[in-house]
């Protein structure tokens, strides 16, 4: 089938990094500066990617794949192939339309990105709070309250050891 | 109707120095992304330099960088290409041509002409 294809369209047989040149009875030429062909037959090459102002190139364009832009210090990629800059905030903060905001009391955010989440509630697992929360870090949960009344031991005593080679019976 | 007309090769020593000209007629050089490609003996076009509106730069290819150097007189309607430091691998046809944009969003050049040869030979 390819034979058969690359008899009747000389195009198929142009790699990546050129066009196929219609002009020129179908030679494969060479992609223009600042352009690409990802893949081989194709009749024009696509512009490359240009990283510019919040943007920064993380990789060039070549004339077979195109650029790949990431952000500048201070801002993180959305979106895919990073279609999108957001502003970093610090932790214990999150993103609104007005800028970097602290969190509320009984939220926290741990990263420079996304929003503050409530802290868990330990009361929900039957559990109590051993260390508070901050805007920055959420809740420790430690053992319920019925693991810690008198004569109740949190630790689990140890497996009886066998004796090697003797089976349990 | 567009042309473009390669003038200034020549033979020239190792070493030695050239001045291309390409001058344009029917349509507007300073308007467009405009260049020079060059197809040595047996072997593939390969694009040499450039000047690129919508890049907002000037390209050269690793080989020339350095050595090469593209510009335009828009009064004259005419782009250069100044070569200098020759080497016997700068043989080739050297074709100016202008980069194509089209509607879909695609990319190609077209170029006119029968080119000029420049050959670097002692």
């Known amino acids: 089938f390819e034979r058969t294809r690359s008899l009747q369209d000389p195009c198929s047989n142009c790699p990546a990094g050129t066009f196929c040149d219609n002009n020129r009875n179908q030679i494969c030429s060479p992609c223009p500066p600042n352009s690409f062909s990802s893949a081989g037959g194709q009749r024009t090459c696509d512009i490359c990617r240009q990283c510019k102002g919040v943007f920064r190139t993380r990789k060039e364009c070549s004339s077979t794949s195109n650029a790949e832009c990431d952000c500048t210090p201070g801002f993180h990629c959305l979106g895919a192939g990073c279609s999108m800059c957001e502003q970093d905030c610090k932790q214990g903060q999150e993103l609104t339309k007005k800028g970097c905001k602290d969190c509320c009391f009984g939220t926290f955010n741990d990263q420079k990105r996304g929003i503050c989440r409530p802290w868990t509630n330990c009361s929900l697992d039957g559990k109590s709070v051993l260390v508070n929360g901050t805007k920055e870090r959420d809740v420790v949960c430690g053992p319920s309250p019925a693991d810690l009344s008198p004569g109740a031991s949190s630790v689990t005593p140890p497996a009886p050891a066998r004796e090697p080679g003797h089976s349990p019976q | 109707e567009v042309q473009l007309l390669e003038s200034g090769g020549g033979l020239v020593q190792p070493g030695g120095s050239l001045r291309l000209s390409c001058a344009a007629s029917?349509?507007?050089?300073?308007?467009?992304?405009v260049g020079w490609v060059r197809q040595a003996p047996g072997k593939g076009l390969e694009w040499v330099s450039a000047?690129?509106?919508?890049?907002?730069?000037?390209y050269y290819a690793e080989s020339v960088k350095g050595r090469f150097t593209i510009s335009r007189d828009n009064a004259k309607n005419t782009l250069y290409l100044q070569m200098s430091s020759l080497r016997a691998e700068d043989t080739a046809v050297y074709y100016c041509?202008?980069?194509?944009?089209?509607?879909?969003?695609?990319?190609?050049?077209?170029?006119w002409g029968q080119g000029t040869l420049v050959t670097v030979s002692s």
């Open positions: 041509a202008r980069v194509v944009y089209h509607a879909g969003g695609g990319v190609t050049f077209d170029y």
């Open positions: 000047i690129l509106d919508f890049g907002g730069s000037t």
């Open positions: 029917g349509f507007t050089l300073s308007a467009e992304d």
